[in-house]
């Protein structure tokens, strides 16, 4: 038993890192494997992760964690039984992936104006709580053309769009996600998407 | 209430072994670290060794490092510093204290909050 | 090995007035958790020691709060705001942020 592509991981930056790998051949994940970590830090203890099957010779590993701080490091080692397959090294803020923004909702009873509300995915006492900025993509689900993204750079979760950038008369779906440029983090996932009918009063032509 | 009672010490000479012992109740004692720290007749303070609550992380000093074994029961909530080779330099009265939650990822430290009364080790011909 | 250094080594008081402990570490004890390493602890004469302050700055359970700890980095305090005659003896901080577990000399403060 070996491992084809070494584990690689992802933290949310809060309390989950997520490691994904690939094995020689198909493996029981939950049963042969184990993967172990271990903050570097004075009187820490190691910790043990089940993966889970993520296709036939890939596993995936969720590593709970209390919290992040910038200079935390984790030891990680890869074994199968006795044998010591993987051992690496783990550092959370330098491999970020922000948590996908929730509730999107679209407010659609401002005159002629789209609200469109989400709520930041961490708690205030969270760092990146101050530093995300999101991308909001909204598509038309009659028309695979009219698909347009709007980069939301402040920090409030929320995009006023006027109501006549899009066709009236049709359905809409938004979805948004994040990232922080602090510590040069990848996208998060989308979140869910919402729907919506857009419509609105044309103005009047005057000939 | 938290307590912690040492014993163990006692005169030896000098290259003979000694097994302290540190009984501890009030705590739920395998989420804690437990820490060792002497102190030698008129001096200050020396940390000798930590152990984690599940005894998988241990630490030494390196005065003591080779020689000394620090281990923990936790069935019996109990801390063992096993002495050997002992030197007229580790003279010393001998504390165990209680150390950080160890069970949590990131170790949580509200300092050595409980001491013990302390065991006295004398190594001299 | 982070090096600790206490001042003064020695310190008459006068009850009722206050004091002042200094601690300086060779090694920066914050982390970035935004907590500092560094404890206070009294000796009192022929006791164990017992803890006054964790964490820099965080009284211990039970710690009058005439104590209080302050400093971060490398530089820190302790203060006693109106000393107590039961407040003699030794104290001493210790940095936990490493192994080895360091302590300073020790400031030994008896009445005057």
């Known amino acids: 038993m070996k491992v084809l592509q070494e584990p690689t991981c992802v933290s949310d930056y809060m309390s989950i890192s997520t490691c994904e790998w690939k094995m020689n051949g198909p493996t029981n994940c939950s049963t042969e494997l184990r993967l172990l970590y271990q903050l570097v830090f004075l009187l820490s203890e190691a910790h043990t992760c089940i993966p889970e099957n993520n296709g036939g010779a890939g596993c995936v590993c969720h590593l709970l964690m209390d919290d992040v701080v910038s200079a935390d490091n984790y030891t990680l080692d890869l074994w199968a039984g006795q044998q010591l397959l993987w051992k690496g090294s783990f550092k959370p803020s330098e491999h970020v992936k922000p948590r996908a923004p929730g509730n999107l909702t679209v407010h659609t009873n401002v005159s002629d104006t789209l609200l469109l509300t989400w709520s930041n995915p961490y708690p205030p006492d969270n760092y990146l709580y101050n530093h995300l900025t999101y991308a909001v993509n909204i598509w038309s689900e009659n028309d695979p053309a009219d698909f347009r993204i709007y980069n939301v750079t402040y920090l409030e979760p929320s995009l006023r769009i006027a109501a006549s950038t899009l066709k009236s008369g049709i359905s809409y779906r938004a979805r948004v996600r994040a990232w922080a440029q602090c510590y040069n983090t990848t996208w998060s996932e989308w979140s869910p998407s919402t729907k919506w009918h857009n419509s609105y009063r044309e103005p009047f032509e005057q000939h | 209430e938290v307590q912690l009672v040492e014993s163990g010490g006692g005169l030896v000479q000098p290259g003979g072994s000694l097994r302290l012992s540190c009984a501890v109740s009030g705590f739920t004692f395998s989420s804690y670290a437990m820490s060792w720290v002497r102190q030698a007749p008129g001096k200050g303070l020396e940390w000798v060794s930590s152990i984690t609550g599940g005894g998988g992380g241990i630490y030494y000093a390196d005065s003591v490092k080779g020689r000394f074994t620090i281990s923990r029961d936790n069935s019996k909530n109990t801390v063992y510093l096993q002495m050997n080779s002992l030197r007229a330099e580790d003279t010393a009265v001998y504390y165990c204290?209680?150390?950080?939650?160890?069970?949590?990822?990131?170790?949580?430290?509200?300092?050595?909050?409980?001491w013990g009364q302390g065991t006295t080790v004398t190594v001299s011909s | 090995d982070i090096v600790m250094t206490q001042s003064p080594l020695s310190l008459p008081v006068t009850p009722g007035e206050p004091a002042s402990i200094s601690c300086r570490s060779s090694h920066n004890l914050l982390y970035s958790n935004g907590y500092n390493y560094l404890d206070w602890y009294l000796q009192k004469p022929g006791q164990s020691p017992q803890l006054l302050i964790y964490l820099g700055s965080n009284r211990a359970y039970g710690v009058p709060d005439r104590f209080s700890g302050s400093g971060s980095g490398t530089d820190f305090t302790l203060k006693i705001s109106r000393v107590e005659a039961e407040d003699v003896g030794v104290y001493h901080c210790m940095q936990a942020l490493q192994s080895p577990y360091t302590f300073g000399q020790g400031t030994k403060v008896d009445i005057k």
């Open positions: 204290a209680k150390d950080r939650i160890s069970i949590t990822i990131r170790p949580r430290y509200f300092g050595l909050d409980f």
